[in-house]
Interface confidence: medium
Amino acid sequence: LPKAPVITTPLETVDALVEEVATFMCAVESYPQPEISWTRNKILIKLFDTRYSIRENGQLLTILSVEDSDDGIYCCTANNGVGGAVESCGALQVKMKPKITRPPINVKIIEGLKAVLPCTTMGNPKPSVSWIKGDSPLRENSRIAVLESGSLRIHNVQKEDAGQYRCVAKNSLGTAYSKVVKLEVEVFARILRAPESHNVTFGSFVTLHCTATGIPVPTITWIENGNAVSSGSIQESVKDRVIDSRLQLFITKPGLYTCIATNKHGEKFSTAKAAATISIAEWSKPQKDNKGYCAQYRGEVCNAVLAKDALVFLNTSYADPEEAQELLVHTAWNELKVVSPVCRPAAEALLCNHIFQECSPGVVPTPIPICREYCLAVKELFCAKEWLVMEEKTHRGLYRSEMHLLSVPECSKLPSMHWDPTACARLPHLDYNKENLKTFPPMTSSKPSVDIPNLPSSSSSSFSVSPTYSMT
């Protein structure tokens, strides 16, 4: 007997994972055999669509490889011409393990700004997103929040926020981890310890100390009266993102010393500055004060010039007389770089004997100045051109320091050997007599301003020059 179709197993909701097989069953009892058709979201599924398999006279619909887009309502309709057509519907829910579609990336950010690390996900059920910093789950607080999108937002970024982050997407089907990314927090350069101002005696050694921090670790430069520091030694050390710079100075003039800490953020720089003043107590002391003691010279610069066993006057107005006077000579020679071979040994002899003056021991040790005649011999014969250049530079303020003023004596203020032969010192290295003068280059004036005496000659008419410390 003919029988109208009856669906004996109504369609149910089917859960399927992406790329897996999903099957709907629509069991029908009827006579004659019905025609069964299938729709998805009310659109007919064509029998020749290769994504589907329809079997058992149309009672089984199989989706061979489920895709996200297969989500929807599937209906089967049975009709055999006896009575009306019957329909049963069921949903396909495509389930998906978590997938991170926009992973976080490395971020460099300046302290105090806002940082956002993206983490966009897919999945069904919708994944929950959490974050790991280092090895520990990240706790949200007033500054740190995980947004609805899964991204991590950090307000007012702090140094301690720096580190390695990864996001974790989780649902009932599984867990997905992003790659580890780095959040680098850059910090503007900041000075932790500013150099201190000092009031010191002429010839002292002073160490200015400047400590700075920042990320990246800043570099420290020193400025002296607006220019890069030209002398002094700088020692630097870096520990725990703190740079420590010490500038050791030999003080021969007052100055403003500025410590500048600089670091770079992308294409921009940040700087921090701190300044200290160095003032000199009793500025005129080195010229006027004769306090000191006699001692054998044990330095290097004047080795070849000073008499081997001579006592020299060490001026205690310097913190470390020996070192200060040694450095004065060395610096003076550097100040007078371009000199002729004729001038050099004479200038060395003059400088050494002027700075390391012969010393007369006694109850009050006394320095013995160079005889005026020897000073003038250097000035007007050996080093006439050089002396003019130096005086011109002095007037025009081209010297870096006041050192040369102490290094080169004013001949006119020195005692003459004609007044008291014991009151002044001769320069044994000016080894010539009046007959030698014909060999010297032309003088700037027609005749010396003082009668040059016959100085004791020796077997050699050449000058003794220290090979280590020459002026060129």
Partner: antibody, heavy 121, light 112 residues
Framework: EVQLLESGGGLVQPGGSLRLSCAAS????????MSWVRQAPGKGLEWVSA????????YYKESVKGRFTISRDNSKNTLYLQMNSLRAEDTAVYYC??????????????WGQGTLVTVSS | QTVVTQEPSFSVSPGGTVTLTCGLS?????????PDWYQQTPGQAPRTLIY???SRHSGVPDRFSGSILGNKAALTITGAQADDESDYYC????????????FGGGTKLTVL
């Protein structure tokens, strides 16, 4: 912090050679004179050699003159002592010492821990 | 050859004062010898106490002082402490034709 680290000591036969090195850190090496001082086992200190900041002059104890050579490489912050024709009486701990200033004969104000040189057959 | 002389040993009571001296076998020690003083405990490197007669090295307590006494250099320790027990060496700059630096034989100081 000033640090001086000697190396190169060891056992050597009489007539042999050794080169001691002293790596300096914590100060501007090129601004200071340096010295080598030795101490024989159970004996007192004995100055061996000195060199000023720029290395132009060198100074030696009479008994090592012509056998020992002091030198420095300011670019490497290193002081050296080349010891040739070694004798049994050269056996000692050799200390590298920093001078208080540029000159070769300033006070010795910082010392290394020393390296032992043993001259024996 | 000039020898630098020091007392081989010396003892002092805790809290007491002791003066160690440094002389020359011929001649006097003067400021031209720039006397320096060093302390050495067994197994350790020497430590600088005083340089150029009377300048105290940084970090050295003011119990230690240097001077010239008569024809010798002197190191005075006031308020001696147990950890002052050490060997003390003087060093002199010498010039006799060539520059030289000579240590004394050392003084063993015992704090009883």
């Amino acid at each position: 912090e000033v640090q001086l680290l000697e190396s190169g000591g060891g056992l050597v036969q009489p007539g042999g050679s050794l080169r001691l090195s002293c790596a300096a850190s914590g100060f501007t090496f090129s601004d200071y004179g340096m010295s080598w001082v030795r101490q024989a086992p159970g004996k007192g200190l004995e100055w061996v050699s000195a060199i000023p900041w720029q290395g132009g002059s060198t100074y030696y104890k009479e008994s090592v003159k012509g056998r020992f050579t002091i030198s420095r490489d300011n670019s490497k912050n290193t002081l050296y002592l080349q010891m040739n024709s070694l004798r049994a009486e050269d056996t000692a701990v050799y200390y590298c010492a920093k001078r208080s200033g540029r000159i070769a004969f300033g006070a010795l104000d910082a010392w290394g821990q020393g390296t032992l040189v043993t001259v024996s057959s | 050859q000039t020898v630098v002389t020091q007392e081989p040993s010396f003892s002092v009571s805790p809290g007491g004062t002791v003066t160690l001296t440094c002389g020359l076998s011929s001649g006097s020690v003067t400021s031209s010898n720039y006397p320096d003083w060093y302390q050495q405990t067994p197994g350790q490197a020497p430590r600088t106490l005083i340089y150029s007669t009377d300048s105290r090295h940084s970090g050295v307590p003011d119990r230690f002082s240097g001077s010239i006494l008569g024809n010798k250099a002197a190191l005075t320790i006031t308020g001696a402490q147990a950890d002052d027990e050490s060997d003390y060496y003087c060093g002199l700059y010498m010039y006799s034709g060539s520059k030289n630096y000579v240590f004394g034989g050392g003084t063993k100081l015992t704090v009883l």
